[in-house]
Amino acid sequence: LTCLGGFASPGPVPPSTALRELIEELVNITQNQKAPLCNGSMVWSINLTAGMYCAALESLINVSGCSAIEKTQRMLSGFCPHKVSAGQFSSLHVRDTKIEVAQFVKDLLLHLKKLFREGQFN
């Protein structure tokens, strides 16, 4: 878990298999989206910083009955060293801003892509 959590600045090393699978799942969600994701459910926006995996999970775990993001929720739990339950919030949440799950997933994916390009692209 220490290894998985330390991706603030990955440099020129590709992601672990687990992180690669998370990115691929986020890609699948964004590319295969037909109807509004999770019926347009809203979640708290988060600061995409070092603790973003736990923050993302804390936000998404409040969405229930949405099979499209269940795999993402399971994957994020593998990146968060502590147990996360619904209603739990960290300081990483932007508590005055709620966004649609679809936008949340897209923002998370874009951020992960930026992180991995950081060490490679000038």
């Epitope: 020129p12 090393v13 590709p14 991995f116 390009r117």
Partner: antibody
Framework: QVQLVQSGADVKKPGASVKVSCKAS????????IHWVRQAPGQGLEWMGA????????AYNQKFKGRATLTADKSTSTAYMELRSLRSDDTAVYYC????????????WGQGTLVTVSS | EIVLTQSPATLSLSPGERATLSCRAS??????LHWYQQKPGQAPRLLIY???QSISGIPARFSGSGSGTDFTLTINSLEPEDFAVYYC?????????LGGGTKVEIK
Amino acid sequence: QVQLVQSGADVKKPGASVKVSCKASGYTFIDYEIHWVRQAPGQGLEWMGAIDPETGGTAYNQKFKGRATLTADKSTSTAYMELRSLRSDDTAVYYCTRILLYYYPMDYWGQGTLVTVSS
Amino acid sequence: EIVLTQSPATLSLSPGERATLSCRASQNISDYLHWYQQKPGQAPRLLIYYASQSISGIPARFSGSGSGTDFTLTINSLEPEDFAVYYCQNGHSFPLTLGGGTKVEIK
């Protein structure tokens, strides 16, 4: 469907520059990096560099750094590869290809652009 | 820079035979290795990604294996359309590099 359509064949004199275009369609242009690969006649494939169309960030093979420039125009979903100070050994087919993230495979390719450098 | 060495340079086989192509990396690249097929006058086509993951639309006779530094592309029971040049590609780190290719020709 995903398509990468490149500009037509070009003939240049040694010392000149060439600019090859690659128009993307069928997907969201800024979601994928565009990479450039060339192939000299009868030779293998050689990676030249890549651009992230969203930020304009680039990465180059050291061999082409300073001589090649990669750009992207988000408004037209078109990527460009300019190669300067052309030599006869730059005669090759130049391909653009897309990659979701650099460690992913090159899943779609342009048809290729033959650039001939001859005096 | 990661150097990929493909062997053999040329493989002469008959339709129906099995082709085994090798790609060796100069350092550990985990499973960040992709395989492409190229026919004369055409752009390369992706066959296998992450060393062993198959692509939809690619016949099941194509399979990949390996991890670390040694990788193999296997074509079970060659079809006439399989005679082409095959390249492996390092996806581990920049510069992205490709092997010199293996030409599979009709015996």
